[in-house]
C-alpha cells in the first residue's frame, strides 16, 4: 500500500485531515499527549480502520476499548474504506489516560478521497483503474512484470504535413490519438473539496522534453485535446470538479531511448492543500505512473516479408522484373522508388532499416533512416514515413559519416539462446574495425549508442572493415529453416569455393569458364583461378577475417557448426588491401520467406549448369527454400553491391512482446 501523510493530533483543538483511499496514513499520538498521561485508546467511525503496533514486543491488535502505552515504540496507522460524502464526515477520537486524571480527548476529522492516476500497467491494452499502489512507481520486465508503455508518436498521420506527429502540439484526429497511451485520473471527493485543494499534473524537468500529455476535453460536438505537459511545460494545474469524476489524458513519447535517456518517464499527480491563503500550498499526496518508451525493434530474415523496396535506375529493368516476380511469389507488396526520386542512388538497403515499435494497444512500423544521405536521402522521410509508419534517424546529418554507417552494415539475428540467456528478439549485428587506427572505419557512435539503448536486441560488434564497402551483409545472411533453431547462418566461404573448384578440376573440368556470357569481362578458367597464388593468398586472408566473425557469432549467438552453412565465394583484395567479391556475392541475397533472390554468380558451366548455383541449391533446397538467381552483374555487382544491397524489406513484427523479456 502506498505511503500517505503523517497526521499529528492534539487535544487543544480538533484536527482536520485528508486521507486518500489506498494509502496508509501515520497518526502521531505521542508528541502532543498531555504530560501526565501514560496510555491512550482509540475510537473511530465505521469508515476508518486503525492499526496499532507496539514494539517491543511486536504485538498487533485491532482497536476496541484496549489501551496502549504512550511510548515511542507505538505505531498508529489508519486507512479509509470509502470516499467521504462530505468534508470531515469520518471521525477518530483519541482518549489519553493517566493515573490521576480523567481522560483527555483529541478529535480528528477525516475526509476520505479517491485520487488515482491509472494507465495500462498490466499491459493488456486496457486501462484499469488502480488505487494508489506502490508498484505503479516501478517498471519491471518479464511476463510477470508491470508498467505502462509509450510509443514515440513518430508517424505522420497528416499527409499534408512534412513533420512527424510528435513534432507538433496538436492532435490531428482519433487516428493520431491511437498512437498515444491513455492515462486516466479518477477522483471521488466531496463536492466542495477542490475549493480548498488543487491537483497538479507534472513531469521531471529532465524528462519534460521526452513526453507530451494532452488532456481530452469532452465538448458537445467532439472530443478536443489540449497540451498540458510537454517540452515547454513541466507542470499543469488541473481544474477538477467535486464528486466522482474521470479525466482522460493521452500521452505520447517524443524521444526513443538513447545514451542519456533510459526510456523511463514518470508522470505524477500531486494534491496540494490550498486552504490557507496566507500560507504556501502544501503537498498532501502524490500518485505516479511510470511509462517506458517502446524500443525500436529490428526484424530478422526469418520474419515473414510484407513489403519489398527497390530502386528503378538506368538499365536495371531485368533486375526489377526478377525482384517483382520474387515479391509476387512471396505475396509481398512491392514499392519501386523511381529514378527521379533516387537521384541515381540504387542502394536501398544502405539508406534505411525498417523495424517497428509496439505497445499493448498499437504496433507501428518505423523506418530508421541512416545518416549516409546520398541520393536516396529523401526517400525514407518523404515516401516511407506516413500514416501509421514512423520515422527515426541518428548520427550526423552533414558529413562525418563512414561507409560503415550505411545499413547494409546493420543486420539482426533470429531469436537465439546463449547458455542461460535468451534473446527472444534476436541480436543486432553490425560491422566495425578490429582496432581503432588513423584510417579505421567504425559505425558512428551515435548510431551505436541508439542501438544499444533499445535494450531488447543486445548488439554484437563484428569485424567488417576488411571489406572495401565494409558491410556485414557482404559475408553473412540468415535463412529460415524447419529444424534446429529455426534458421541457418550463411557465411561466405572462400575455402568452400576452392574445394568446389578443385573437385571440378579433378573431374576434368579445369577449362570451364567463370564469367561466361559476361561481355567485356575477362573469362577465367577454373585451372587458372586455382593456380593464381596471389588470389589464393588474398582469399586466405579473407577466410581468416570471416573465421574471426564465425567464432564471434558462434559465441555471441550460441551457434554450433551445424547451424552454419558455407556459401562458396571468392574475394579479391583491392586498393588499401580491402576485399570485394571476385564474382557476384551470393550471400548478399534477398530473403522473402522461403523464396531467395540470390546474385547470379556466373560460375563455370558444367554439364549445362552453373556449378556454383548447383552447389548453393544443394545446400539450401533441403531446408525447403527456393533459389532464384538474379543477374545483377552490370547494374549492381560492378558497383560494389548485390541484390541485398539494392533492396529492402518490411517484415511482420514478432509475435513475442518485447516487455515480456528480461534484457
Amino acid at each position: 500500500m502506498a505511503q500517505g501523510t503523517l497526521i499529528r493530533v492534539t487535544p487543544e483543538q480538533p484536527t482536520h485531515a485528508v486521507c486518500v483511499l489506498g494509502t496508509l496514513t501515520q497518526l502521531d499520538v505521542c508528541s502532543s499527549a498531555p504530560e501526565d498521561c501514560t496510555s491512550f485508546s482509540v475510537n473511530t467511525s465505521p469508515g476508518v480502520v486503525v492499526d496499532i503496533a507496539h514494539s517491543p514486543p511486536a504485538k498487533k491488535k485491532s482497536t476496541g476499548s484496549s489501551t496502549w502505552p504512550l511510548d515511542p515504540g507505538v505505531e498508529v496507522t489508519l486507512t479509509m474504506k470509502a470516499a467521504s460524502g462530505s468534508t470531515g464526515d469520518q471521525k477518530v477520537q483519541i482518549s489519553y489516560h493517566g493515573p490521576k486524571t480523567p481522560p483527555v480527548k483529541a478529535l480528528l476529522y477525516l475526509t476520505g478521497v479517491e485520487i488515482s492516476l491509472s494507465a495500462d500497467i498490466t499491459r493488456t491494452g486496457k486501462v484499469k483503474p488502480t488505487r494508489a499502489v506502490e508498484d505503479k512507481r516501478t517498471w519491471t520486465w518479464g511476463p510477470c512484470g508491470q508498467g505502462a508503455i509509450l510509443l514515440v508518436n513518430c508517424d505522420r498521420d497528416n499527409p499534408e504535413s512534412s513533420a512527424m506527429d510528435c513534432e507538433d502540439d496538436e492532435v490531428l484526429d482519433s487516428k493520431d490519438l491511437k498512437d498515444m497511451s491513455l492515462m486516466t485520473l479518477s477522483t471521488k471527493t466531496p463536492q466542495d473539496f477542490f475549493t480548498r485543494h488543487t491537483l497538479v499534473l507534472h513531469v521531471a524537468r529532465s524528462e519534460m522534453d521526452k513526453v507530451r500529455v494532452f488532456q481530452a476535453t469532452r465538448g458537445r460536438l467532439s472530443s478536443r485535446c489540449r497540451v498540458v505537459l510537454g517540452p515547454k511545460q513541466p507542470s499543469h494545474y488541473l481544474m477538477v470538479p467535486g464528486g466522482k469524476h474521470n479525466m482522460d489524458f493521452y500521452v505520447e513519447a517524443l524521444a526513443f531511448p538513447d545514451t542519456n535517456f533510459p526510456g523511463l518517464i514518470t508522470l505524477t499527480v500531486s494534491m496540494l492543500d490550498t486552504s490557507k491563503l496566507e500560507l504556501p500550498e502544501a503537498v498532501v499526496f502524490q500518485d505516479s505512473v511510470v511509462f517506458r518508451v517502446a524500443p525500436w525493434i529490428m526484424t530478422p530474415n526469418t520474419q515473414p516479408p510484407q513489403e519489398v523496396y527497390v530502386c528503378s535506375i538506368f538499365e536495371n529493368e531485368d533486375f526489377l522484373k526478377s525482384v517483382t516476380a520474387l515479391a509476387m511469389q512471396a505475396r509481398c507488396k512491392l514499392t519501386i522508388c523511381p529514378e527521379e526520386e533516387n537521384m541515381d542512388d540504387q542502394w536501398m538497403q544502405d539508406e534505411m532499416e525498417i523495424g517497428y515499435i509496439q505497445a499493448p494497444h498499437k504496433t507501428l512500423p518505423v523506418v530508421f533512416d541512416s545518416p549516409r544521405n546520398r541520393g536516396l536521402k529523401e526517400f525514407p522521410i518523404k515516401r516511407v514515413m506516413g500514416p501509421d509508419f514512423g520515422y527515426v534517424t541518428r548520427g550526423p546529418q552533414t558529413g562525418g559519416v563512414s561507409g560503415l554507417d550505411s545499413f547494409g552494415n546493420l543486420e539482426v539475428s533470429p531469436p537465439v539462446t546463449v547458455g542461460d540467456k535468451e534473446y527472444p528478439l534476436g541480436r543486432i549485428l553490425f560491422g566495425d574495425s578490429c582496432y581503432p587506427s588513423s584510417d579505421s572505419r567504425e559505425m558512428h557512435q551515435a548510431l551505436q549508442d541508439f542501438l544499444s539503448a533499445q535494450q531488447v536486441q543486445a548488439p554484437v560488434k563484428l569485424y567488417s572493415d576488411w571489406l572495401t564497402v565494409g558491410h556485414v551483409d557482404e559475408f553473412l545472411s540468415f535463412v529460415p529453416a524447419p529444424d534446429r533453431k529455426g534458421f541457418r547462418l550463411l557465411l561466405a566461404s572462400p575455402r568452400s569455393c576452392y574445394k568446389l573448384f578443385q573437385e571440378q578440376q579433378n573431374e576434368g573440368h579445369g577449362d570451364a569458364l567463370l564469367f561466361q556470357g559476361i561481355k567485356k569481362k575477362n573469362q577465367q578458367k577454373i585451372k587458372n583461378i586455382l593456380s593464381n597464388t596471389t588470389l589464393r593468398e588474398h582469399n586466405s586472408f579473407v577466410e581468416r577475417c570471416i573465421d574471426w566473425n564465425r567464432e564471434l557469432l558462434k559465441r555471441e549467438l550460441g551457434l554450433a557448426e551445424s547451424d552454419i552453412i558455407d556459401i562458396p565465394q571468392l574475394f579479391k583484395l583491392k586498393e588499401f588491401s580491402k576485399a570485394e567479391a571476385f564474382f557476384p556475392n551470393m550471400v548478399n541475397m534477398l530473403v522473402l520467406g522461403k523464396h531467395l533472390g540470390i546474385p547470379k554468380p556466373f560460375g563455370p558451366i558444367i554439364n549445362g549448369r552453373c556449378c556454383l548455383e548447383e552447389k548453393v541449391c544443394s545446400l539450401l533446397e533441403p531446408l525447403g527454400l527456393h533459389c532464384t538467381f538474379i543477374n545483377d552483374f552490370y547494374t549492381y555487382h560492378i558497383r560494389h553491391g548485390e541484390v541485398h544491397c539494392g533492396t529492402n524489406v518490411r517484415r511482420k513484427p514478432f509475435s513475442f512482446k518485447w516487455w515480456n523479456m528480461v534484457p
Epitope: N522, K572, K574, E575, F576, R639
Partner: antibody, heavy 128, light 111 residues
C-alpha cells in the same frame, strides 16, 4: 579518358577554410579512384588524400588528417576537398588525380596508389 | 624531408642512359609492388610514366623502364632525348599511417 579540372583555390588567412572541387568530363567519375596531391612552391609532390569508387572509405596524409575532408558526389561527377584550419605550410598547388577502377583485374592492381590522369591544379595561398 | 629518398639531380647526354634511384624501407618500397614514377615539366602537371614497378601506361615510350631490388626502386631512361629534361618523382604504397609516399624528386638535365 576522363579529364579533370580543379577549382576553388585562392588566398585565405591562417585558420580559414576553403573547399576545392574537382570536376570530371569525358567519363563517369564514379568509376575512378580519386586522390588529391599538392606541391608547395619550388618543392616536391606530397600525397594528401584518397577516396575510393564505392565512396566507402577515405584516407589522409598525417599532415592533414582531422583538418581536411575528401568527399564525392557521383551525381555531380565531382570530388571535393574541404580544407579547414588552414596553415601557412598548406600553401601549394593542389592537383586532383585519378585512376580507373578496372573491375576486370583478377587481383589487386594497385590503381589506388598511382595516378594516371591529372588536372592542371589550383593554387591555395595561406597568408595573413 | 621526404619519406622516399631520391638523388637531387642527375644528368646525361642525348642518346645516353640514366638511372634514378628511389630508396625506401621494408614497410613501403620493399614490401609492395606498388611503385610508380612521374615526370613533371616546369609549370605542368605530373604525368605517370611507370606503375606497379615496371609497367608502362600506353603512350609512354619503351625507353622508360622500372625495376626494384630490396628497398630500392629504379627508373632507367635509355636513349636520352632533350624532351626528357624534367623533374622525376617516385611514389610507393606504404603501410605507415600515410599510405602513399613520394620521393623528394630528381632533376634530370640533358646536357
Amino acid at each position: 579518358q576522363v579529364q579533370l579540372v580543379e577549382s576553388g583555390g585562392g588566398l585565405v588567412k591562417p585558420g580559414g577554410s576553403l573547399r576545392l572541387s574537382c570536376a570530371a568530363s569525358g567519363s563517369t567519375l564514379s568509376d575512378y579512384f580519386v586522390s588529391w596531391i599538392r606541391q608547395a612552391p619550388g618543392k616536391g609532390l606530397e600525397w594528401v588524400s584518397f577516396i575510393n569508387t564505392a565512396n566507402t572509405f577515405t584516407y589522409y596524409a598525417d599532415s592533414v588528417r582531422g583538418r581536411f575532408t575528401i568527399s564525392r558526389d557521383n551525381a555531380k561527377n565531382s570530388v571535393y576537398l574541404q580544407m579547414n584550419s588552414l596553415r601557412a605550410e598548406d600553401t601549394a598547388v593542389y592537383y586532383c588525380s585519378s585512376a580507373n577502377d578496372d573491375v576486370d583485374d583478377i587481383v589487386a592492381p594497385g590503381r589506388g596508389y598511382y595516378m594516371d590522369v591529372w588536372g592542371r591544379g589550383t593554387l591555395v595561398t595561406v597568408s595573413s | 624531408q621526404s619519406a622516399l629518398t631520391q638523388p637531387r639531380s642527375v644528368s646525361g647526354s642525348p642518346g645516353q642512359s640514366v638511372t634514378i634511384s628511389c630508396t625506401g624501407t621494408s614497410g613501403d618500397v620493399g614490401r609492395y609492388s606498388h611503385v610508380s614514377w612521374y615526370q613533371q615539366h616546369p609549370g605542368k602537371a605530373p604525368k605517370l610514366i611507370i606503375y606497379n614497378v615496371y609497367e608502362r601506361p600506353s603512350g609512354v615510350p619503351d625507353r622508360f623502364s622500372g625495376s626494384k631490388s630490396g628497398n630500392t626502386a629504379s627508373l632507367t631512361i635509355s636513349g636520352l632525348q632533350a624532351e626528357d629534361e624534367a623533374d622525376y618523382y617516385c611514389s610507393s604504397h606504404s603501410r605507415s599511417s600515410t599510405p602513399v609516399l613520394f620521393g623528394g624528386g630528381t632533376k634530370l638535365t640533358v646536357l
